[in-house]
Amino acid sequence: LVPHLGDREKRDSVCPQGKYIHPQNNSICCTKCHKGTYLYNDCPGPGQDTDCRECESGSFTASENHLRHCLSCSKCRKEMGQVEISSCTVDRDTVCGCRKNQYRHYWSENLFQCFNCSLCLNGTVHLSCQEKQNTVCTCHAGFFLRENECVSCSNCKKSLECTKLCLPQIENVKGTEDSGTT
């Protein structure tokens, strides 16, 4: 099955690469606007220039286009802990990221929040913190991993997963409790 092409894609495919079909006259192919510019007026005829204008401050186009308006620059989400890595220019959107020793957690495809990398206290770093993934920790004996932090086995309740990792400690606690009864 051939995927359906949208109207714009259909119109563009008639013209060679870097050109688009005139919306009012499908016998004319106009040159697309360069990145950093947008379409102000279509070319008046074959071989004539398309009227492209530079994007205004606060807007951009990142590729050749025949958009009637530039795209608005993204704003980094301070409430998500994001910082600006590079400012928006006429041909590139704002680049947002996280501070040093932080990683991104994605809530949706385009929305991320910055979190501090785990330090693996009472454990060792198994995998270093990455741009999109927290540090992976391995805990020392007597500690178990909970929400990527090494927690003392004294905080391990019988009902929790940690019982396997903290078995000797659990037995000791049980033994102490039992020895108290006479």
């Epitope: 957690h105 809530w107 949706s108 929040q113 979190f115 929400e147 990527n148």
Partner: nanobody, 120 residues
């Protein structure tokens, strides 16, 4: 069929507390990030809080930080929002949503919402 059923709303005095619940069915709850979104009378939708699939990551809007706590019980397929120190400006219909559907019209894909009214 995905179903999200919010409950726990009601009338409460300023400074009071409420606990909202959202019972989920029709999808693998423990695989999805979930969130609470609210709509005050005559206003747009506002993100309130998010939680990841295993409860390790949470997000709170500045307006509720320190007062609201999001949690989930994957064994019960339920999402919670503990709301303390409630203010008049917290008055809204609260919806729970699976985060993939955040951009979708709430009345189409979300629950019916639960109304929280903070008034003396």
């Amino acid at each position: 069929e995905v179903q999200l059923l919010e409950s726990g709303g009601g009338l409460v005095q300023p400074g009071g507390s409420l606990r909202l619940s959202c019972a989920a069915s029709g999808f693998t709850f423990d695989k999805y990030q979930m969130g609470w979104v609210r709509q005050a009378p005559g206003k747009g939708l506002e993100w309130v809080s998010f939680i990841d699939s295993n409860g390790h990551h949470t997000y709170y809007a500045d307006s509720v930080k320190g007062r609201f706590t999001i949690s989930r019980d994957n064994s019960k397929n339920t999402l919670y929002l503990q709301m303390n120190s409630l203010r008049a400006e917290d008055t809204a219909v609260y919806y729970c949503a699976e985060l993939d559907n955040l951009s979708i019209t709430p009345f189409d894909y979300w629950g019916q919402g639960t109304l929280v009214t903070v008034s003396s």
